[in-house]
């Protein structure tokens, strides 16, 4: 990681638990204010590798429900609605940070985890064609 | 949130602090061993709606680095590797947490932070508003 | 229980025409792709066509592609392969196949066959 | 198209023994890979999915495992109802195609 220079505003914390153990306020602060994910909703449903919203909801973790993607088909949508046998579906993964309770069904203590999610679909050629 | 139970073995934390600032371990625990999300890097290139990354730093941030996919085109790519018009390539995006310090500079100080990165791109039938 | 049922092999001569029928039952036809396979004597298994739900896509590989055609009555819940131009390396059993899909990747179900000698 | 190579193209051994039949594919496959089982005179019957996913009904002695060209079938305990045939099939690239076969007998 990148070394901060110590704020002297900044709370205390001895050496040997740093960076180990932090604490994080837990008020999200959204950045989003500008755009609206609501407007890429419709995606799903009109791509040409459309795909399914599925609810994974974890108790233990922070956030406790995330959406993951599943293409509902093998291969593309052409634009009669059938599929392309020459083109596939795949998902579009991505790792992102979550917070797991820590020891179990504590309140307020985390590790920090990270985990794949699959976030759309997208569709690609199977074959890359090798050039000599 | 869901009311969890204390556990006896947990950390304690005045309820006037919670759960507004909560203990995080930052040792990452990836639960990632099983797939390997090297294997999709090349769909960015074989996309019929490609995408190129782009880096966004920022060290008062965890995680600091973060990619963002930018559309190559506005339409898709055709099997002839022409693009077609028709149809547009969208950027697929996800609300992700991120760490904030804060305090700016604070090295075991942050809050919670929703951000909003585009993953990916996926080719779309655009909407057509029908005039009466 | 799902059942699929080839008929219409034989024997036929190179050059010659021959017409598959597979009758499906069981479950509800118009919902799954459908495959045609076939294994000659003694060998593997080798995709010969495929065709989608409602018949809107299909796929042939080179070795068959323009002498055989797969389609579907859905009405009938059957699936063809008209086969023309048969050649001796043709001579195969047939097998058609069931998708868990609407679109014909991997097969669930098959037939029990049926035997296409092309001989003189 | 893609080439699938399986080996060993047969194979004896013996009631409870571990049973491993491998299949490489000419080029990645991102787990779109099936394998079936064929008796003589029967039609194949489809055991695995995706590389790893046990179709309905199918024993848990059967498994499957790998990513990218390399796959691997296990039986993890042979019973003598197991002595068939057995083939792979990609299906990331048409035309979808099938490994040469391994044949299972029993010692």
């Known amino acids: 990681g990148i070394a901060i220079p110590r704020n002297s505003g900044c709370p205390n914390s001895e050496d040997k638990n740093f960076p180990r153990t932090v604490m994080v306020n837990l008020n999200i602060h959204n950045r989003n204010t500008s755009t609206n994910p609501k407007r890429s909703s419709d995606y799903y449903n009109r791509s040409t590798s459309p795909w399914n919203l599925h609810r994974n909801e974890d108790p233990e973790r922070y956030p406790s429900v995330i959406w993951e993607a599943k293409c509902r088909h093998l291969g593309c949508v052409k634009a009669d609605g059938n599929v392309d046998y020459h083109m596939n579906s795949v998902p579009i993964q991505q790792e992102i940070l979550v917070l797991r309770r820590e020891p179990r069904h504590c309140p307020n203590s985390f590790r920090l985890e990270k985990i794949l999610v699959s976030v759309g679909c997208t569709c690609v050629t199977p074959i890359v064609h090798h050039v000599a | 949130g869901i009311a969890i139970p204390r556990n006896s073995g947990c950390p304690n934390s005045e309820d006037k602090n919670f759960p507004r600032t909560v203990m995080v371990n930052l040792n990452i625990h990836n639960r990632n061993t099983s797939t390997n999300p090297k294997r999709s890097s090349d769909y960015y290139n074989r996309s019929t709606s490609p995408w190129n990354l782009h880096r966004n730093e920022d060290p008062e941030r965890y995680p600091s680095v973060i990619w963002e996919a930018k559309c190559r085109h506005l339409g898709c790519v055709k099997a002839d590797g022409n693009v077609d018009y028709h149809m547009n390539s969208v950027p697929i995006q996800q609300e992700i947490l991120v760490l904030r310090r804060e305090p700016r500079h604070c090295p075991n100080s942050f809050r919670l932070e929703k951000i909003l990165v585009s993953v990916g791109c996926t080719c779309v039938t655009p909407i057509v508003h029908h005039v009466a | 229980e799902v059942q699929l049922v080839e008929s219409g092999g034989g024997l036929v001569q190179p050059g010659g025409s021959l017409r598959l029928s597979c009758a499906a039952s069981?479950?509800?036809?118009?919902?799954?792709?459908m495959s045609w396979v076939r294994q000659a004597p003694g060998k593997g298994l080798e995709l010969v066509s495929i065709?989608?739900?409602?018949?809107?896509?299909?796929f042939y590989p080179d070795s068959v592609k323009g002498r055989f055609t797969i389609s579907r009555d859905n009405s009938k819940n059957t699936l063809y392969l008209q086969m023309n131009s048969l050649r001796a390396e043709d001579t195969a059993v047939y097998y058609c196949?069931?998708?868990?899909?609407?679109?014909?990747?991997?097969?669930?179900?098959w037939g029990q066959g049926t035997l296409v000698t092309v001989s003189s | 198209d893609i080439q699938m190579t399986q080996s060993p193209s047969s194979l004896s051994a013996s009631v409870g023994d571990r049973v491993t039949i491998t299949c490489q594919a000419s080029?990645?496959?991102?787990?779109?890979l099936a394998w079936y089982q064929q008796k003589p005179g029967k039609a194949p019957k489809l055991l695995i999915s995706?590389?790893?996913s046990l179709e309905t009904g199918v024993p848990s002695r059967f498994s499957g495992s790998g990513s990218g060209k390399d796959y691997t079938f296990t039986i993890s305990s042979l019973q003598p109802e197991d002595i068939a045939t057995y083939y792979c099939?990609?299906?990331?690239?048409?035309?979808?195609?099938f490994g040469g076969g391994t044949k299972v007998e029993i010692k």
């Open positions: 995706g590389a790893t």
């Open positions: 069981g479950f509800t036809f118009s919902t799954y792709g």
């Open positions: 080029e990645d496959i991102y787990d779109r």
């Open positions: 099939q990609q299906y990331w690239s048409v035309p979808w195609t």
């Open positions: 065709i989608n739900h409602n018949g809107g896509s299909t």
């Open positions: 196949a069931r998708d868990p899909r609407h679109d014909g990747y991997f097969f669930d179900y």
